[in-house]
Structures are given as structure tokens and as C-alpha cells.
Amino acid sequence: IWELKKDVYVVELDWYPDAPGEMVVLTCDTPEEDGITWTLDQSSEVLGSGKTLTIQVKEFGDAGQYTCHKGGEVLSHSLLLLHKKEDGIWSTDILKDQKEPKNKTFLRCEAKNYSGRFTCWWLTTISTDLTFSVKSSRGSSDPQGVTCGAATLSAERVRGDNKEYEYSVECQEDSACPAAEESLPIEVMVDAVHKLKYENYTSSFFIRDIIKPDPPKNLQLKPLKNSRQVEVSWEYPDTWSTPHSYFSLTFCVQVQGKSKREKKDRVFTDKTSATVICRKNASISVRAQDRYYSSSWSEWASVPCS
Amino acid sequence: RNLPVATPDPGMFPCLHHSQNLLRAVSNMLQKARQTLEFYPCTSEEIDHEDITKDKTSTVEACLPLELTKNESCLNSRETSFITNGSCLASRKTSFMMALCLSSIYEDLKMYQVEFKTMNAKLLMDPKRQIFLDQNMLAVIDELMQALNFNSETVPQKSSLEEPDFYKTKIKLCILLHAFRIRAVTIDRVMSYLNAS
């Protein structure tokens, strides 16, 4: 058993049929010695008396808010949560496996630049009685500070018969130099509590590996005289690290119709303009990627050909 | 000494061309190592990230773009210099800061060159003959060093009398390649910045 926060404790349980469970001793936070009784949740049934209560925690029915009273007055609370371990593996029931970039990916993180600011998100099908708490650091043995905000519900989607909820959090490394060469990864830890179930999820990464620039901005087309060719130009996204001559991007320019199966014109360039062949009912799209360290491509910025 | 004309565009900053070749060569070598040593811990997640130049050179700080010198976090505790202007071209005057940056890059290359050559000598003794260093990568390191045109003491190649542990050598190769790739990215960024200056 360990303390998650004040008056909230996590009991780690090996979860299998007829498991013996864990013996837990609760102590009432009071100078009083006599006349103390214990109850669980909203029940008025007295579970025991005395300053300490010893319980055998085996299942979710044994978890919850234990309260010690004296003469009708509440003295203190202890909330017990369960953390299940099945076949030596901690449960991951609360969050959905996003399977990208690999299986067992519950947390996904992205950074728009090298400033040390990043966003992580996760998915769940649970809609109520759900809380998240996020901590982060650079390295684990001698951790350096990363400050994370509160996790918020950022999107709701319908997936077949189920509703899916996306939560996200923004974090900022306290003292980040965009030009630094990372040798210690960022660690992100998410505590998830659903009703009386506790789970924790972690992710470890270098900012350089989670870079995904914003799409190029200000796409413009200029038809070339006596030709089907069009000169398309664009600018670096505002959120990208500066100076741009140091933090350079490379671009992919594509002309394609509505369907992905349609024929296309595609060209890669380090410049902020390119010449392509425009077709009726097609769109010109441009996306960006760090020129020197191949992490993710940005989303496409698009303009119609016509 | 005249710089080798290794770039098709005569106006182009020659070190930029060499640094692009360097990044490409080390990336290819790292990819090859990850594929060949698939049963060794050779991915970014599996290895310890060590920097053999730590406390010996200060490339990131010495080559910091002017715009980032206002960023407290980039100035650390070391004496930091930053790029003002200039290039690798022998005909142009380079500032003191600039020379500091380029000499730091040169020292990095020299240290990695020695490490890679020592390692290759060990790998050539491996009866499995599983992996060797790409000669192209070693040649590209040499070309960039020549283009930087610094003279410095020759670092003797480390020789070891003990029987090499090939497993450890291969893991060290992975560690070294990962670190060198990150440094090659920094070098490329610096050269690109200088080219635009």
C-alpha cells in the first residue's frame, strides 16, 4: 500500500481467483484514543472500533472511503483504491491502446517545435467517475523539471456503438534550449482513477522524436504563362522554432483529386515554393518535416487548383 | 591549402555540402546497424545515450545561433560563444566566435573518427564478420575535416592488447552511431545557418 495523495491510498493486488489479498491497517488521524468506530462509504454498518482498523483487501467491494467517527462526528477519511496485477502485468483497463506507433501505446505525445513544450493525449470509453493526474520530468534518476497542466477532455467521438473520449495535457520543460542535444528522455506519468480502480501509464521520449510541425501557412498559387504548371508558394508555420535557417524544414507538395486512389503529382523540396501541374477538381497540398531529423510530417495545408 | 571543390553549385558554402553527406552517411550506417544487429539492443529506446565529446568540446554552445543567445537555458554554465557571420571558405575572414564553432566541430569529427577506426579494427577481428563500418562514412568524415581546414594534433588510434568482446563492441557501435547522428544533425543545422548568414 502506498499514498497517492493526502488520505488516498493505493493497494496493489495480485488478481487471480481465490487470491489472499492484502492486509491493510488503517489509522484514524486523531489524538482521540477511545470510542472510535469505522464505516465504509455511505453505509452506517460499523466495521470495527478503535484507533486502527485491520482489513483484508481482496476485491473492489473492500475498497472505498473508510471513515472513522466519534459520537457522530467524522474524524478522518482514508480512500482505498485498487491497482490490479494479473499474471505479473498491471491492468490497463481504463485507457484504450492506440496501437500507434506500436502496440501497448496508451499515451501519445507531440511537439510543434523544439521549445520544450509538448502535448500528450489518450483515449478512453469511460465517461464518468474518472480523474487523471499527470507528472513529467527530464530523466528519472536525477529528474529535471517539467510542468504539466491539468488533463482536460479535448474531444468526443462516436466509434460504432461506443463513444470515445480523448483527454489531453500540455507540458513545458522548465528550462529548455531548442538547440540542445537531448541525452536524457522526457518521462510522462499519468495516474488514472476510475471509481475505485487505479492505473498508471508512462511514456518516455526525446522531444526530437515527437516533433510534428504545424502545416505550412499562407499557401498561394501563381499560374505560369503558356503552361499547365502552377507555382505554389508557402511560409513556415508560426509555431516552428527560429531561426529557420538553423531549424530548417523540408516540404512535400502534392496535387491530387478527392480520392486517394487518383493520380497525382508529387515533388519534395527544401524551398518554400515549387512548380506543379494543376488539374481540374484537384487540390494542391503541402506538408512539412524537420529537414535534418526525420520525425513526423505535419498535416497537409491545401488550396483548390481552380 | 585549397579546399576541394566537391559541390556542383560553386556559390554554395562547401561545408554545407559535406555536412549533408555526413548526416546521410551516418543515418545510413545507423539504419544498417539496426537491421544487422536486430537481436542486439540498438534502437534509440534500448541504448544508453552517451556523448564521447562531453566536457571535451562544446559544439552546441559554441555554434549557438545569435537568436538563441537571449535564451537563458541555452547559455548553461559554460562560457558560450555564438556565430556571427562567416563561412568555411578560405577566402572569407571568419570571426573569432566562428572559428571557435568550426574548430569545435573539427574536434568532434576527429574524436569520432578515432573511435570509429578503433572500433572497425575490432570488428574486422570478429569471426562472425557481422558488421563493419561503412568506408563511405569514414571518407565523408575525412572530407568535412579537410574542408574545415584546421590543423590540430593527431590523436593516436587506441590500440587494445586484450581480446575484444565483440558483443560489447557492437553495442558500443550502436551507442556511438546514435550519438554521432545527433551531432551530425547539429552540424548540419549550423552549416545551414552559416550558409544563410
Epitope: R228, Q229, R261, E262, K263, K264, V267, D270 | D9
Partner: antibody
Amino acid sequence: QVQLVQSGAEVKKPGSSVKVSCKASGGTFSDYYLHWVRQAPGQGLEWMGWIDPENGDTEYAPKFQGRVTITADESTSTAYMELSSLRSEDTAVYYCARNKELRYFDVWGQGTLVTVSS
Amino acid sequence: DIVMTQSPLSLPVTPGEPASISCRASQSISINLHWYQQKPGQAPRQLIYFASQSISGVPSRFSGSGSGTDFTLTISSLQPEDFATYYCQQSNSFPLTFGQGTKVEIK
């Protein structure tokens, strides 16, 4: 199986024209760009131009501009390349090639040898 | 027009040995570079697209690398069927242009 089948070899006199055909099978004809590339005996490859069979748009290499015409007939899934004012240096194997991507070629025809000789 | 220069023009190789062919562009073409193989009396066959992207059906011993002006096609271990002429082609701008070809011959 995508295939491009070209017309047979031709012998032409200098100053005349030649029209080579390229019939496509497998896949929808208009879903691909179609190019013509030639290869003189013992020489390298030389791109001549492309057509978008969907709308008839064409683009030619400046070297052949005014002398080459590429057309396509969607009803028969056939593309044509006509080269006029032939000279001896036009003696070459002419290939048609296609792709969903405009600027490179994933499927090639077997080639048509055009000999220009007086 | 962008001029593509291949080297060497002829490459004698022992079967089972690796081979590398270089292709250089007269100006930067990013990764807009493709490789083809041609055997005598046959049409070219696509090997690699956009400098390093492999094609299904092409043996994994063929790999491409490079960007900007310098590109390389590598055959990790030459098989008897690999003796042919190899061409690079740029798609950065029209007109599309090819290298002059590299003939890989049996040593």
C-alpha cells in the same frame, strides 16, 4: 496485371512522320499518366512527354516541342506518339510508360524500334 | 535542364560482392530521384522511387540513399540476374532527365 503493349517496328524515311501506339490493359486507362521515353541504340534514356488521358493535357520536353504529338483514345485505352520531320538521329526504341504519379514510371511497354534511314 | 551524371559508367563486380552506383544532379533536387534497371533487349524496370523508397517485388538487396545532389544505389550482394544497366532519373522539374547509365558487368 497491368500491361502496356506497343505497335511493331517501323522503318521511315527522313522528313516523314511515325505514329507509335501503346495499348493499356489492367486498371482504368484514365487513372494513369502516360509518358513516352526513347532510347537511341547503345545510348541512355530520353524523356519526350506525357499525356493525361482523362482530359488530354500534355507536356513535352523542349527538345521535341513542335515535332511530337501525344494523343490518347479512352475508348480503346490506347495512347499514341507521333513524331514528325524525322531524321536519322531519331532512330531509337520508343517506350511508353505509365504511373499514377506524374513524374516517374512504374510500368513500361516492351518498346518499338523506329529506324530512320534513306 | 537538370543534368544527371552517373559514375562509374562501367562497374565490374564479382558475384556475391556489393556494388554502389553514384548519381549526381547539377542542382539540388531534394529526394526527387528514381532508379531503374535495364537488361539488354528489355524495357527498364523500376527499382527505387524518391531516393530510398523500396518497391514490392524488388529484392531487398537493392537500396537507395541520398538527397540534394548526391545519390547512391547499393546492391548489397550481387546476384547473376543483377548484371544490367542502371539509370537514375530526376523528377524535380520538367523536362524529366536521366543519368547516362551504369553498366554492372561480371568481373
